[in-house]
Interface confidence: low
């Protein structure tokens, strides 16, 4: 069965200054490739977290993404402010050359 990306929470309400937990799980380890979190959609979407690389000072992962069989890609965003409001997407990429290819979005 083809991999599905599941974001079970349709909305998350967080008080200013608190931490938001955004849940995301994949139903399969195949295809191989990283997960990225975005706010908004389209080419101008804002990258919130990239499993592969980058510097995301307010983001921590709920589980250890380095573990080979991990399928939990949930993240926590600290010190929430009104500027963080928006729709967040958990996106699975398929490993490719030279660039990874977007495979499926939550």
């Amino acid at each position: 069965e083809e991999l599905q990306v599941i974001q079970p929470d349709k909305s998350v309400l967080v008080a200013a200054g608190e931490t938001a937990t955004l849940r995301c799980t994949a139903t399969s380890l195949i295809p191989v490739g990283p997960i990225q979190w975005f706010r908004g959609a389209g080419p101008g979407r804002e990258l919130i977290y990239n499993q592969k690389e980058g510097h995301f000072p307010r983001v921590t992962t709920v589980s250890d993404l380095t573990k080979r069989n991990n399928m939990d890609f949930s993240i926590r965003i600290g010190n929430i402010t009104p500027a963080d409001a928006g729709t967040y997407y958990c996106v699975k990429f398929r490993k490719g050359s030279p660039d990874d290819v977007e495979f499926k979005s939550g």
Epitope: G42, G44, R45, P57, I77, D84
Partner: antibody
């Protein structure tokens, strides 16, 4: 009036450090992503760094990665660029620029719609 | 990175005549979901910071005179000044907004003949 004013430029020796500041006024600073863009003497524009409205996402050009640090203080309506290990090739006018779009969540969706006048950084021995 | 190539490097046009600047991207900047091209044009006059003229390849920024127009799609774009005025003497830059990092063209200098 929407305005960005840079400061902190100057003459510094190779290997030295500088901290640039950009003071914003006339708009809701905390709603906008911000950028630093530089222009070497007689040359074109080079994007340097980006910071999202809430500081959750930061990008750097490969040429400055590991040496420059972008930050912001929304309470003070200010953007900063800490520049370490400066090189001669960092000599340029540094502009802060607003990423248009506000709450659109798309940092470059309208281009960079407000620019400061720039501050000059000269790296020379 | 997406490479932006502008032509010509410089352009001399008589007052009141048309000026045309070209910009080519190394890959398409057209986003099929909304049919928008993520390309902007900037004007930089001597001693001044850049000014956003056009975004989405063809949408004029507020306050920009209608003699400035943008066209093109995919990888090939054009900025046209329909009737050159003395105050249009400047360097013009294109910039792609489609992928990080946002990259600029090398610039086209417009002068009066």
């Amino acid at each position: 009036e929407v305005q960005l004013v840079e400061s902190g430029g100057g003459l510094v020796q190779p290997g030295g450090s500088l901290r640039l500041s950009c003071a914003a006024s006339g708009f809701t600073f905390s709603s906008y992503s911000m950028n630093w863009v530089r222009q070497a003497p007689g040359k074109g524009l080079e994007w340097v760094s980006y910071i999202s409205s809430s500081s959750s996402t930061i990008y750097y050009a490969d040429s400055v990665k590991g040496r420059f640090t972008i930050s912001r203080d929304n309470a003070k309506n200010s953007l900063y660029l800490q520049m370490n290990s400066l090189r001669a090739e960092d000599t340029a006018v540094y502009y802060c620029a607003r990423g248009g779009g506000g709450y659109s969540y798309s940092p470059y969706i309208y281009g960079m719609d407000v620019w400061g006048q720039g501050t000059t950084v000269t790296v020379s021995s | 990175d997406i490479v932006m190539t502008q032509s010509p490097d410089s352009l001399a046009v008589s007052l009141g005549e048309r000026a045309t600047i070209n910009c080519k991207s190394s890959q398409s900047v057209l986003y099929s979901s909304n049919n928008k091209n993520y390309l902007a044009w900037y004007q930089q006059k001597p001693g001044q910071p850049p000014k956003l003229l056009i975004y989405w390849a063809s949408t004029r920024e507020s306050g920009v005179p209608d003699r400035f127009s943008g066209s093109g799609s995919g990888t090939d774009f054009t900025l046209t000044i329909s009737s050159l005025q003395a105050e249009d003497v400047a360097v013009y830059y294109c910039q792609q907004l489609y992928l990080y990092p946002p990259t600029f063209g090398g610039g086209t200098k417009v002068e009066i003949k």
